[in-house]
Structures are given as C-alpha cells and as structure tokens.
Interface confidence: medium
C-alpha cells in the first residue's frame, strides 16, 4: 500500500466565489474516497466535480475533486480522503 499525497489549491471563479481543488497523487491501490465536506459532512455529488483515477506512470494513481464555494467561507470546507483504511482531512489554504 502506498498512501496518497494530498494537495489542496484554490483559484478565482466568478465574483465572490472560488474553486477549491483537492488532488491525491502517488497512491496504490487505486480505490480511494476523495470528497469535499462542509462543516464536517460531505457535499452532494452534484456540487462536486471529480477527475478520473488515472495511472501516473510510476505504478501508482492520481485523481482530484473540485467544488465552488463562497469566498470568506473557506474555513468551513475540508477535503476528506480515505484510502486503504486510513483517512485524513485537508483544509483550504488561506
């Protein structure tokens, strides 16, 4: 088992909103849960966009999930990752 490296980034979206993206990379096996949470509970699927779980060329995999949130509410959102029985939570950078 190779645990993922998780990285959260933010980018400007429409006025008053930002897009936050959570990337998991270099993990094996390929089964992974990656989702955005607000106040600790998962957002609905229709408010998130997922990338495919793809091989990254090193025998491991990568994927991402993104969502759009209101600027100023970043602290309420975290990226939740679960892989091979381990989980971690990652904040939106300031």
């Amino acid at each position: 088992t190779v645990p993922p490296m998780v990285n959260v980034t933010r980018s400007e979206a429409s006025e008053g909103n930002i897009t936050v993206t959570c990337r998991a990379s270099s993990f094996y096996p390929r089964n992974i849960i990656l989702t955005w949470r607000q106040d600790g509970v998962s957002l609905s699927a229709d408010t998130q966009q997922w990338g495919d779980v793809l091989p990254d060329g090193n025998g491991t995999y990568q994927t991402w999930v993104a969502t759009r949130i209101c600027r100023g509410e970043e602290q309420r959102f975290t990226c939740y990752m679960e892989h091979s029985g381990n989980h971690s939570t990652h904040p939106v950078p300031s």
């Epitope: 949470r37 607000q38 106040d39 600790g40 509970v41 998962s42 957002l43 609905s44 408010t47 602290q75 309420r76 975290t78 989980h87 971690s88 939570t89 990652h90 904040p91």
Partner: antibody, heavy 122, light 112 residues
C-alpha cells in the same frame, strides 16, 4: 466513545475574560470537530462555534464572533474557548460536545462534557 | 436563522403512556447534501444533554427502541411508545442543516 472533561466553575467580574477548557481522552483528537454551546439557567441551548481539531479551522455563530475564540492544543488533546468582555448576559453553563461524522455519518453533538458554570457578577 | 418551535411546552404523562412531541422549523431544513440533519436530545435535571435521534429517524447507539423520530420538510415528531421514569426531562429538537445551527425551546415531559 471517549471522555470530555471540562474545567471547573468560574466566578468573574463584568468586562473580564475567561478561558474554558475541554480535555478529551479515548479517541483520536485530531480527527474530530468540537463544538461549544451555551445554556442559560432554565433556558434552551445555543450553538456558539465549532473547531476542527486536525487543522484548527473554525466556524462561528455570528452572534458570538466578537465574544468567543476557539483554539485547540493537540499535544494535550484539549479544546479551549476564550470568552471576552463578559456581561451578566454571559452567565450560563457552557458545554463542549464532539461531533460524530464517522460513526454515524452525521450526528452533531454525540458526546458531551459535563459543562462549566460561568457566573458574571460584580 | 432557522427558528425551531416545539410544542407542547409541557407534557404531563403517566408512566407507560405514549408521548408525542412536535418540532416545527421556520424553513425547510434539508442540507445542501440532501440529508436532513434534525436531531432530538434529552436533558435530565443537572445533567448534560444526550443525543437520542439523528437525521430525523436514526436512533443513536444505546437509545432504546421505544424512541422513534419521523417527519420531513418543516414538521418533525418524536414519539416515546411507553414512557418510563428515566425518560422524564426536557427534550430539545435541533437542526444542523443551516448555519447557525439552532435548537428548539424544549418540551418538558413530566409525571401527570
């Protein structure tokens, strides 16, 4: 389930500040959201704010943003709430409570501390 | 803020009776993820509140099956099928779908 042990009763003067603690044990502290709640004698409960112990991220009830400040010390698995510029309206029991998002996928205040009575009086 | 209104304020019961407690929210409390985070708590005198029901109808661990929750949208009910002495106290409903999270004013269940 684990335990949440709150600090003892406080008698403070108007205008002062008080820092309440909530020491936890028996669960992985950094995985958890901890909320603080207020209950005046004979009244209902008010949610003040939560803090995510893993990151220190917070979300406040706007009513308390100027009054409360939440922090955690992961080395001692303790959550803190500092309450400032106290008035007699702040006399209440304050509870810490742990959310249970993993075990039940959405129970807010699953486990509670015993409460700390704060009395504000000149 | 979402206003949670509980009725009745006081509910006198005889042991063994069924009790029905009502909670109404001032707006729909479906979270943006589709779940309804409506909970019920029991607080006995001098004690911290205890979670009974989460997500409208799910009993929390260790809660007896005489407690059941139901409802949707803005109207919710907690039923106690056969009231026991240990069930006496103040029951609060709570919504965790919209910040700030809010509690109802409580219903006191007491002996008739």
């Amino acid at each position: 389930q684990g335990q949440m042990q709150q600090s003892g009763a406080e008698l403070v003067k108007p205008g002062a500040s008080v820092k309440l603690s909530c020491k936890t044990s028996g669960f992985t502290f950094s995985d958890n959201y901890i909320s603080w709640l207020k209950q005046k004698p004979g009244q209902s409960l008010e949610w003040i704010a939560w803090i995510y112990a893993g990151t220190g991220g917070t979300s406040y009830n706007q009513k308390f943003t100027a009054k409360a400040q939440l922090t955690v010390d992961t080395s001692s698995s303790t959550a803190y709430m500092q309450f400032s510029s106290l008035t007699t309206e702040d006399s209440a029991i304050y509870y810490c409570a742990r959310h249970d998002y993993y075990g039940t996928s959405g129970a807010w205040f699953a486990y509670w501390g015993q409460g700390t009575l704060v009395t504000v009086s000149a | 803020d979402v206003l949670m209104t509980q009725t009745p304020l006081s509910l006198p019961v005889s042991l063994g009776d069924q009790a029905s407690l009502s909670c109404r929210s001032s707006q729909n409390i479906v979270h943006i993820n589709g779940n309804t985070y409506l909970e019920w708590y029991l607080q006995k005198p001098g004690q911290s509140p205890k979670l009974l029901i989460y997500k409208v109808s799910n009993r929390f661990s260790g809660v007896p099956d005489r407690f059941s929750g139901s409802g949707s949208g803005t109207d919710f009910t907690l039923k106690i099928s056969r009231v026991e002495a240990e069930d006496l106290g103040v029951y609060y409903c709570f919504q965790g779908s919209h910040v700030p999270w809010t509690f109802g004013g409580g219903t006191k269940v007491e002996i008739k």
